[in-house]
């Protein structure tokens, strides 16, 4: 069988408050219950793990507490988004997915989404 | 289904050989990484070496460079592992594992893996 695609954006631009959000879908080539996404950061070839959530279809995304991302499911789409981002986050997000469940085990991994990232300019002070 | 079979551990002296195999079947593409990695009881799974299927990159852990050799038969869908010098910090289970990437990907990290076989165990005792 073929890898499993998974496609994102190429490109977005976060928001002044260092919020990006991206949709990651990939074509099941099964009835899969249980998913796990995961988004990497690659960055001059290295490659971090951002955040983790498995979910079951139907159900929300759960990441952890203290995660920088949240999420929902639709179907073979996840929304996701990743705040507190600044200008050195700045580098190719990639979407992982593993249908983990009933079997086969099947993995697929987008191609990323570049993620530009701009920290505000700081006010200036006023005299008033 | 994606399937990898490893073949070809055993018990080998220190100083001595082996060639490990890894069959591949169920998938296809023009694109993918390979990879042998090892685990004992007490360590986390690492990276040996790997090789990319177009161009043939390949990486390999600072601990076996210049005695592990990694290579590919596109033809028979099998990657091997020539292992020489082999040392009993060498002992632990093989495994291989796949991972469906595109040219955009770094080569060979261990993130892009979850395709994986059973595993072939390497004792390395006198």
């Known amino acids: 069988c073929k890898a499993m695609h998974v496609a994102q954006p190429a490109v977005v631009l976060a928001s002044s408050r260092g919020i990006a959000s991206f949709v990651c879908e990939y074509a099941s080539p099964g009835k899969a219950t249980e998913v796990r996404v995961t988004v990497l950061r690659q960055a001059d070839s290295q490659v971090t793990e951002v955040c983790a959530a498995t979910y079951m279809m139907g159900n929300e995304l759960t990441f952890l507490d203290d995660s920088i991302c949240t999420g929902t499911s639709s179907g073979n789409q996840v929304n996701l988004t990743i705040q507190g981002l600044r200008a050195m986050d700045t580098g190719l997000y990639i979407c992982k997915v593993e249908l983990m469940y009933p079997p086969p085990y099947y993995l697929g991994i987008g191609n990323g989404t570049q993620i530009y990232v701009i920290d505000p300019e700081p006010c200036p002070d006023s005299d008033f | 289904q994606v399937q990898l079979v490893e073949s070809g551990g055993g018990l080998v002296q220190p100083g001595g050989s082996l060639r490990l195999s890894c069959a591949v079947s169920g998938f296809s593409s023009d694109y993918y990484d390979i990879g042998w990695f090892r685990q004992d009881p007490e360590k986390e799974r690492e990276m040996v070496s790997c090789?990319?299927?177009?161009?043939?990159?390949?990486k390999y852990a600072d601990s076996v460079k210049g005695r592990f050799t990694i290579s590919r038969d596109n033809a028979k869908n099998t990657v091997y592992l020539q292992m020489n010098s082999l040392e009993p910090e060498d002992t632990a289970v093989y495994y291989c594992?796949?991972?469906?990437?595109?040219?955009?990907?770094?080569?060979?990290?261990?993130?892009?893996?979850?395709?994986w076989g059973q595993g072939t165990r390497v004792t390395v005792s006198s």
């Open positions: 594992g796949l991972a469906p990437i595109s040219p955009v990907h770094a080569v060979c990290n261990q993130h892009y893996f979850g395709y």
């Open positions: 090789i990319r299927s177009s161009g043939g990159s390949t």
